[in-house]
């Protein structure tokens, strides 16, 4: 049974029975607010196997592990996440392990596990094959690993049971409980998942697999469901739905909405199933359940009910997808995220109209604000306290607000704020004025001329580059010495490349400044030689392949106030040379006569240029006795190997607990005062704690229905 | 396994109107589609229309005044009817299981001529 | 309507050639389309949905691809019983419609 569209458990334990025939909820799970402790262990729902978007434990008392409750989960999808996340453990008093020894694959998404305090077997889990990426994983106030002396299966009596992996150079043994192990697929299944029994899964299947190589028999389908098959892709004339089904039109024109009971139906567009028609088109009628492009724009107009819509993160950035026209005002407040540029265009992109101010305060992973990148009106029909329409505050990373070549940006009243941008030069601040239409309306203290691009190379002079040479898998590159008025001023040079097919980069592409960018740096040092042109080898590239390069000053950017002069080159498009191709794969040989070799292969998986034709060599071999000098059925003749184990047990030092080496010095001191900027990383870290917290209760704190 | 079959009159009076049935197996009216088309001598297939599973229909435009699609769930049958047929109707009429058009009928060939 | 073109009614072959048949759309198809062989006396098989997946029991030396509006069967490795009429088939938007089709026959 599918169940949804979300479900939602709280106050009453006994509501889990809810859950009693679901193999699949197409919606999040909460479970939550379950104040009185109970006995859970009568509760058990092992036909759920796959939550299509996201599961969520809070404050529930006496539930000590998941793995009894949900022991055949194997996939949360992600589909819609919880504040960026798939999975949330949070405040869960009696949570002892999650225990969900067959959680195999969360999709979309990472995972926030915060303030458990009787948490353990956390270390144990290795979510890297789970989750695609870890980074974002928030695990944080949870018992500490020392209390906890987690113990995977068969430890104790030397008999381990688990596999080991490497989780921050620790190789350890990967387990859920202290008796239920992680499982790994074997490595010849690739990203293929496995049975039981390790045998390998057909490549539709997700998580796990009743019997192998077979698409009717998976636990979860990696791409779509459709009669009972694992598909890549819908059938004609069925539709996606919820991003994992397969549907037919009736279905789809049965929907009833969740979110209203008086919106017109779901809607068939490009082989989906959806809520509504996408931005760019529109109903074939109001009864219609399909969509017709728009003559022109067609607006899709969003209202914030509180006027100020928040953009903290990728969960709120989705209320707006597909949004053109949005009646109210963005605050946009992003410290932090994966891939956050690209997401935030991906659901803000389309909005053209604010109608509104616009702020955007605090935002350090912003490198720039072209994920806006349809923005062309800033109505100004609420303002800030002191007119403003357009108010930039303490963006640390922010260096380009748009490209002001290909971007037409009105802002038709109110005024524009700027401060403690350290990265943002106050040129580009002056053209966003010239371009939206605001010269003249800010007075002197709007646009702080010593605290915006005070840590950036500002006026950039150009770089010219003067030789290139390339070979199979290197570029060497030169460039003018640059010679800023006071030479001192100079540090050093940073190239910048990265593979580019075409030739359409920017030099902000895909960048945000939580380490998501698409750019490798090299960092070049200033040849002692005054009159030797700076130059680098770039190795290590792949033959035959076009590669985008530019280069940067690294220059002191203040000196007594004033700006001085940076400099960086325009992108160079580059391409190595071609080079022997990797072997021709699958190669097969076969005897169809005495005297003749049939022999097949197929193109080599890196050509390194363009293919002109193959050789083949062949010569006869002698045939090797060696081969029949052992009897390989007998275990005797092969030597088996020992290796010591290396460990000693070794009792932990504890005269003088409270000590560090800190200084010069080698003896006991204090510990170390801390520095600023880990004072300020610590305040950052609790205010994103504090709004993932908001966050949380406002989404679940909700009035009864009456 | 999914069948579809379909039965027609062979020739037809111009002016005259024509019916066909569909029959199917191995799978439910009641929960899939059941798609019509034509191929005329030596030209293309020519999309017509469809009754799906909850009854509903949609035809192609320039046809849709001649054209009615009906079903019978018990039956399991799925009946084409056209009216005020002219020499151009002659062709191979098909019906298809919608979702999926993977499961197509044999084909019953229709002459329009007097 | 969206007008499915195949500009190539007949195209000649030798078993064992790779031999390539194309469609273009009139307007963006995404990847709602299927290919289908058809033999006199027979009903049409298909061959392809989604621009690209085979239809189970599909020998793999018929692939499709493209996406938007240009689309492409290719046969890899002909064989005497591939000797048939290809058509193309968008299931994007409704009404659905067909390519004029593309004769394989032998050189």
């Known amino acids: 049974e599918i169940c949804g569209p979300g479900i939602d458990i709280r106050n009453d334990y006994q509501q889990l029975k809810r859950l009693e025939n679901c193999t699949v909820i197409e919606g999040y799970l909460h479970i939550l607010l379950i104040s009185k402790a109970e006995d859970y262990r009568s509760y058990r729902f092992p036909k759920l196997t796959v939550i299509t978007e996201y599961l969520l434990l809070f404050r529930v008392a006496g539930l000590e592990s998941l793995g009894d409750l949900f022991p055949n989960l194997t996939v949360i999808r992600g589909w819609k996440l919880f504040y960026n996340y798939a999975l949330v453990i949070f405040e869960m008093t009696n949570l002892k392990d999650i225990g969900l020894y067959n959680l195999r694959n969360i999709t979309r998404g990472a995972i926030r596990i915060e303030k458990n305090a009787d948490l353990c077997y956390l270390s144990t889990v290795d979510w890297s094959l789970i989750l695609d990426a870890v980074s974002n994983n928030y695990i944080v106030g949870n018992k500490p690993p020392k209390e906890c002396g987690d113990l995977c299966p068969g430890t104790m009596e030397e008999k381990p049971m688990c596999e080991k992996t490497t989780i921050n150079n620790e190789y350890n043994y990967r387990c859920w409980t202290t008796n239920r192990c992680q499982k790994m697929c074997p490595s010849t299944c690739g990203k293929r998942a496995c049975t039981e029994n390790n045998e390998c899964c057909h490549p539709e299947c997700l998580g796990s697999c009743s019997a192998p190589d077979n698409d009717t028999a998976c636990v979860a389908c990696r791409h779509y469901y459709y009669a009972g098959v694992c598909v890549p892709a819908c059938p004609p004339n069925t539709y996606r739905f919820e991003g994992w089904r397969c549907v037919d039109r009736d279905f789809c024109a049965n929907i009833l909405s969740a979110e209203s009971s008086d919106s017109e139906g779901f809607v068939i567009h490009d082989g989906e199933c959806m809520q509504e028609c996408p931005s760019g088109f529109i109903r074939n009628g109001s009864q219609s359940m399909y969509c017709i492009p728009c003559e022109g724009p067609c607006p899709k107009v969003c209202e914030e009910e509180k006027k100020t819509k928040t953009i903290d993160s990728v969960t709120s950035a989705q209320m707006l997808q597909g949004c053109t026209i949005f009646k109210g005002n963005l605050l946009i407040n992003i410290r932090r995220g994966n891939n956050i540029a690209s997401e935030l265009e991906n659901f803000m992109g389309l909005i053209e109209v604010v109608t509104g101010y616009v702020k955007i305060r605090h935002s350090h992973a912003l490198v720039s604000l072209s994920f806006l990148k349809n923005l062309r009106l800033i109505l100004g029909e609420e303002q800030l306290e002191g007119n403003y329409s357009f108010y930039v505050l303490d963006n640390q990373n922010l260096q380009q607000l748009w490209d002001w070549d290909h971007r037409n940006l009105t802002i038709k009243a109110g005024k524009m704020y700027f401060a403690f941008n350290p990265k943002l030069c106050v040129s580009e601040i002056y053209r966003m004025e010239e371009v939206t239409g605001t010269k003249g309306r800010q007075s002197k203290g709007d646009i702080n001329t010593r605290n915006n691009g005070e840590r950036a190379s500002c006026e950039s002079d150009v770089l010219h580059f003067t030789s290139t040479t390339t070979s199979k898998n290197r570029i060497i590159i030169t460039w003018h010495r640059y010679r800023p008025p006071d030479y001192r001023d100079l540090i050093s040079f940073t190239v910048y490349y990265k593979e580019a097919p075409f030739k359409n980069v920017t030099e902000y592409d895909g960048q945000d400044a939580c380490g998501s960018n698409s750019w490798n740096m090299v960092d070049v040092d200033l040849p002692p030689n005054k009159d030797v042109e700076p130059g680098i080898l770039l190795h290590g590239l792949k033959p035959w392949t076009q590669y985008a390069v530019y280069v940067k000053a690294v220059t002191l950017t203040m000196v007594e106030n004033d700006h001085i002069r940076g400099a960086k080159s325009e992108i160079l498009y580059i391409r190595t040379n071609a080079s022997v191709p990797s072997i021709p794969l699958d190669v097969l040989s076969a005897s169809n006569s005495s005297s003749q070799l049939i022999v097949k292969w197929n193109p080599p998986s890196l050509p390194n240029g363009n293919l002109s034709y193959y050789i083949v060599r062949w010569q006869r071999q002698p045939q090797d006795g060696y081969l029949y000098r052992h009897n390989y059925c007998s275990k005797d003749k092969i030597p088996i190997r020992k290796y010591a184990d290396g460990t000693i047990d070794i009792e932990e030092v504890t005269e003088n607990p409270k000590t560090e080496v800190c200084g010069g010095e080698k003896g006991p001191c204090c510990a170390c005062p801390k520095t600023e900027a880990e004072k300020q990383a610590e305040k950052e870290e609790a205010e994103y704690r504090k709004v993932f917290e908001n966050f949380l209760h406002n989404s679940i704190f909700v009035p009864r229905p009456e | 396994q999914v069948q579809l079959k379909e039965s027609g009159p062979g020739l037809v009076a111009p002016s005259q109107s024509l019916s066909i049935t569909c029959t199917v197996s191995?799978?439910?009216?009641?929960?899939?589609?059941v798609s019509w088309i034509r191929q005329p001598p030596g030209k293309g297939l020519e999309w017509l229309g469809v009754?799906?599973?909850?009854?509903?229909?949609y035809y192609h435009s320039p046809l849709k005044s001649r054209l009615s699609i009906t079903k019978d769930n018990s039956k399991s049958q799925v009946f084409l009817k056209m009216n005020s047929l002219q020499t151009d109707d002659t062709a191979m009429y098909y019906c298809?299981?919608?979702?999926?058009?993977?499961?197509w009928g044999q084909g019953t060939s229709v002459t329009v001529s007097s | 309507d969206i007008v499915m073109t195949q500009s190539q009614k007949f195209m000649s072959t030798s078993v064992g050639d790779r031999v390539s048949v194309t469609c273009k759309a009139s307007?963006?198809?995404?990847?709602?389309v299927a290919w289908y062989q058809h033999k006199p006396g027979h009903s049409p098989k298909p061959l392809i949905y989604?621009?690209?997946y085979r239809y189970s029991g599909v020998p793999d030396r018929f692939t499709g691809s493209g996406s938007g509006t240009d689309f492409t069967l290719t046969i890899n490795n002909v064989q005497s019983e591939d000797l048939a009429e290809y058509f193309c088939?968008?299931?994007?938007?409704?009404?659905?419609?067909f390519g004029a089709g593309t004769k394989l026959e032998l050189k």
């Open positions: 298809a299981k919608h979702e999926g058009m993977d499961y």
């Open positions: 191995g799978f439910s009216l009641n929960e899939y589609g």
């Open positions: 009754i799906w599973g909850g009854r509903d229909t």
């Open positions: 307007q963006n198809v995404v990847t709602n």
């Open positions: 989604s621009a690209s």
């Open positions: 088939h968008q299931y994007n938007n409704f009404p659905l419609t």
